[in-house]
């Protein structure tokens, strides 16, 4: 039903889902520090512009009995639960923050008539693609495989002189969320990447992955699989690998790879991770320093959110229209604001634009270094080191298939 | 608009190191390339290295391998490139230049170093 | 390293004439070139990028075009600024400069 949003006057409330069900473990309390300091921010930024406003953040808790799992499984309901009790308390604010967790999300845009904006960090998922009123400041799973794709394609660089077409996937349902989304995206028959294909199977168990390793007969040599290097050694440890499998692990949000004083293992010589290109610091945050590394870009989505709240009323409110409008509700796409560490770009669709990077170890300095990067808002790789110091044959990444020629 | 502001002009004697600044102001630094190239007297330009702020690690050209040093440091928008073991052909003028990756849109004035015994 | 060949290595034309640069690689760089125009005294300007791409703020009359091996710079009529050196750039591989053109007043 249709709830009336504190949203006029002067007076303008942002409405944060504190929901039990998460794609990431992080304390409420972080997500509450990293709001008021976005809030903080926006107050400033508002002033600064000659606008005399109020602008503050209700905390919506969920019933913490009834949606215990902590993760995104039972995320369903607890999102239509909170947005009854908004709706009971008639507490609804110009936008809503949060859900992460994708089930939550689709559920809430389904089942509501969204005339107001609605800002995710996370919903990773292909089913929260498309959804004219849903931002989403986390990475969605859409931009991994367009990535993927793209550098399967790709033949023309130094150290990329093939073009592939098959892959294996692990995904044991084990993984995060952000994982869980990402590797269903690449197992999904009808999605962009296993369209783009040729040859395309999911290892489910860790005796598949063990044995492909070392399998004369296997199908391809390129093996996908999500999470950080401790995820991989529990699977791989130390046993040999082909000399033309090339494994890439996705860990996106984790910038610990770049830390000064990161030595990479042995057993990740023949991996490219997948990350996203790290902040330029947020260590010195009042909001960040109790995070590690792989939560900081939950809690900066967070505040990110609250700062593209601020950035969307500016401007309404400088050309004298109205928050409560279908505009505004369908504006938080399409443009570039000033994020919290940086500029922040949404495409066409409210989801974030992100430079992501891939990296490989060097044979000799035993660091990560940058292979290339891919700017999801264009659709392009740059290349950064052309003569790595790669493991593989020639310092060039293999062919897909082994024993097939130049394609 | 973003400008690139380098050190000022060096003399030095074969066999030493040099080591030029250039400090971005006016835009984004840590996520670009900082490129440095030179050119010596009526000739040509060449590039020596360059390095992307935000991930730390310089890539260098062959021939500059192991002879040339470049870093950034983030905090001050500032890269550095030291040449050592510096010989008479080195007399150049270095540039830095800003980049999308290796192509280079934004360059600094240039900095003449001479190398004379 | 790629060999980029520019020629002619000194080209003279009247102004309010045209000019046509080439540049050639060794090897394949796809469309990853770029073309810098150099005064005296003075650092390098972008012109173009992606071998056709004119940079932000560079007038109409310059143009770029070539894949692979061969590329050309056009300047369709030529002002009293533009005589300088040219060179061309590959970024498919560690960048490399061609040798320069030097476009002189005839």
């Known amino acids: 039903s249709q709830v009336s949003q504190n949203c006029h006057n002067g007076s303008y409330e942002i409405s944060v889902l504190m929901m039990g069900n998460s794609a990431f473990a992080e304390p409420l309390k972080n997500l509450e520090d990293a709001v008021n300091e976005g809030l903080e921010i926006v107050r400033g930024r508002l002033q600064n512009a000659g606008l005399n406003v109020t602008v503050n953040a209700t905390f919506m808790y969920s019933d913490g009995l009834i949606h215990n799992s902590g993760d995104c499984r039972s995320s369903t309901c607890e999102g239509l639960d909170l947005l009854r009790k908004i709706s009971n308390a008639q507490r609804m604010g110009c936008v809503l923050i949060g859900p992460s967790c994708t089930y939550s999300t689709f559920q809430m845009y389904l089942d509501t008539e969204l005339s107001y904006p609605m800002i995710s960090a996370g919903s990773f998922g292909l089913s929260c693609d498309y959804k004219e009123t849903l931002t989403r400041l986390m990475s969605p799973a859409r931009k991994l495989m367009y990535f993927l794709v793209n550098f399967w394609k790709t033949n023309d660089l130094p150290f990329k002189t093939y073009s592939w077409s098959t892959s294996y996937v692990y995904k044991n349902g084990t993984e995060t969320e952000d994982c869980f989304w990402y590797l269903n995206a690449l197992e999904a028959s009808v999605s962009y990447f296993s369209h783009e294909l040729g040859f395309k199977v999911v290892l489910r168990q860790d005796k598949e992955f063990q044995d492909i390793l070392m399998d004369h007969n296997r199908k391809s040599n390129v093996i996908i699989m999500c999470g950080g290097p401790e995820f991989l050694y529990k699977l791989k440890g130390d046993r040999a690998v082909a000399e033309d499998i090339v494994i890439i692990l996705v860990d996106l949000f984790n910038d610990q790879y770049f830390e000064d004083n990161v030595t990479a293992p042995d057993y990740m010589k023949n991996v490219l991770v997948l990350t996203l290109s790290p902040g330029n610091s947020l260590l010195n945050s009042s909001f960040s320093r109790n995070l590690s590394p792989t939560k900081r870009d939950f809690a900066l989505a967070y505040l990110n959110g609250i700062l593209l709240f601020g950035h969307m009323l500016k401007i309404f409110l400088e050309n004298g229209e109205n928050i409560t409008t279908p505009k505004f509700a369908h504006a938080f796409r399409n443009l570039t604001f000033e994020g919290y560490d940086g500029p922040v770009t949404l495409d066409d669709w409210g989801d974030v634009d992100s430079t992501m990077v891939l990296l490989y170890t060097s044979v000799d300095t035993k660091k990560y270094k940058v292979l290339l990067t891919y700017d999801t808002h264009v659709n392009k790789t740059y290349p950064v080191d052309m003569s790595p110091t790669f493991t593989w044959k020639n310092s060039k990444l293999p062919n897909d298939i082994t024993g097939r020629g130049p394609q | 608009e973003v400008q690139l502001v380098q050190s000022g002009a060096e003399v030095k004697k074969p066999g030493s190191s040099v080591k030029v600044s250039c400090k971005a102001s006016g835009g984004t630094f840590s996520s670009y390339a900082i490129s440095w190239v030179r050119q010596a007297p009526g000739q040509g330009l060449e590039w020596m290295g360059g390095?992307?702020?935000?991930?730390?690690?310089?890539n260098y050209a062959q021939k500059f391998q192991g002879r040339v040093t470049i870093t950034a440091d983030k905090s001050t928008s500032t890269a550095y490139m030291e040449l050592s073991s510096l010989r008479s052909e080195d007399t150049a003028v270095y540039y830095c230049?800003?980049?999308?990756?290796?192509?280079?849109?934004?360059w600094g004035q240039g900095t003449t170093v001479t190398v004379s015994s | 390293d790629i060999v980029m060949t520019q020629s002619p290595a000194t080209l003279s034309v009247s102004p309010g004439e045209g000019a046509t640069l080439s540049c050639r690689a060794s090897q394949s760089v796809s469309s990853n070139l770029a073309w810098y125009q150099q005064k005296p005294g003075r650092a390098p300007r972008l012109l173009i990028y992606g071998a056709s791409t004119r940079a932000t703020g560079i007038p109409a009359r310059f143009s770029g075009s070539g894949s692979g091996t061969e590329f050309t710079l056009t300047i369709s009529s030529l002002q009293s600024e533009d005589f300088a050196v040219y060179y061309c750039q590959q970024y498919n591989n560690w960048p490399t400069f061609g040798g320069g053109t030097k476009l002189e007043i005839k």
């Open positions: 230049a800003r980049g999308h990756y290796y192509y280079m849109d934004v």
């Open positions: 390095i992307i702020p935000i991930f730390g690690t310089a």
